[in-house]
Amino acid sequence: VKMAETCPIFYDVFFAVANGNELLLDLSLTKVNATEPERTAMKKIQDCYVENGLISRVLDGLVMTTISSSKDCMGEAVQNTVEDLKLNTLGR
Amino acid sequence: EICPAVKRDVDLFLTGTPDEYVEQVAQYKALPVVLENARILKNCVDAKMTEEDKENALSLLDKIYTSPLC
């Protein structure tokens, strides 16, 4: 949950690619005004996930989840929260 | 804002060598089945995507990272 809060559109696109869901990918890419060549590039990546099957998608999803919830990222998220709190306090 | 570790993972997936990408994944999930899968996906992407495709994917990622939705 925390990781999706840091950049929800990135995780929308990543999981659409990894799930092999073309419709979902199109919807996500529309949100960032992707050009046709950009869509083509993402669909080539999606093809690799589809060709390698369900286990492949699950394993790569596991990698992304693990990195996103690692101390490298969680430390970053905590730091950002601290900075936000400081700014909010200064702004009052 | 996207986490730098995630950004590095995606950058290496697109522009790194298979060894570089898998070594990076291994820092987070050192399971043979996961690492073999990561290499298979990386090899597939390298074979399917032209340099132009990779540039387009990187430009899309820039849009994602700078989007208000990120």
Epitope: - | D19, E23, A26, A30, P32, L35, E36, N37, R39, I40
Partner: antibody
Framework: QVVLVESGGGVVQPGRSLRLSCAAS????????MHWVRQAPGKGLEWVAV????????YYADSVKGRFTISRDNSNNTIYLQMNSLRAEDTAVYYC????????????????WGQGTLVTVSS | DIQMTQSPSTLSASVGDRVTITCRAS??????LAWYQQKPGKAPKLLIF???GLESGVPFRFSGSGSGTEFTLTISSLQPDDFATYYC?????????FGQGTKVEIK
Amino acid sequence: QVVLVESGGGVVQPGRSLRLSCAASGFTFSSYGMHWVRQAPGKGLEWVAVIWYDGSIKYYADSVKGRFTISRDNSNNTIYLQMNSLRAEDTAVYYCARALIPVAGTDPIFGYWGQGTLVTVSS
Amino acid sequence: DIQMTQSPSTLSASVGDRVTITCRASQSVSSWLAWYQQKPGKAPKLLIFKTSGLESGVPFRFSGSGSGTEFTLTISSLQPDDFATYYCQQYNTYSPTFGQGTKVEIK
């Protein structure tokens, strides 16, 4: 790019010893398990031994257990195969191979190979 | 040790042919199977791992399939550079074993 260079092969009498070396470059040596694989003249491939990325664990084929010892020097990016009590059936080209996938416990998939060094055991 | 048996031992084919090599394991190796290509006087080269995963730089005309005890390597359209000996290898155990090899020669 990954480069593996074996050396130390030659002609040796049965019962004698020989030490093979494999110098590695072009990759993060200390992250990968390393193997020796051999091929008798005109025959197929036979896995010989593996050493973990940090040298902590070693496995051997039954045919060489107790006679061969694999070791590595991560500061010099080199692995070794100490071969004792050599037999005629040990005659082969010995290849050094890098594991495809990094870190410990990874599967024995041979991603990169050296050019091989010939060991001939003959009286 | 798990025994790996390849068939045929020798295969005569022409450029453009579709070629299939079979590899059987004496017991299940799940999907932990690799294929290598070797040319005379050269070291083997990894083509495929985990049954169907193409290694970097290997052309798409090579493909692998199977699971358990029966596996195949297929070359969809044989090229002059493909005449070589092919080996399967299981890595289900930490005592990896190879098939005896299949030599693909010019008809």
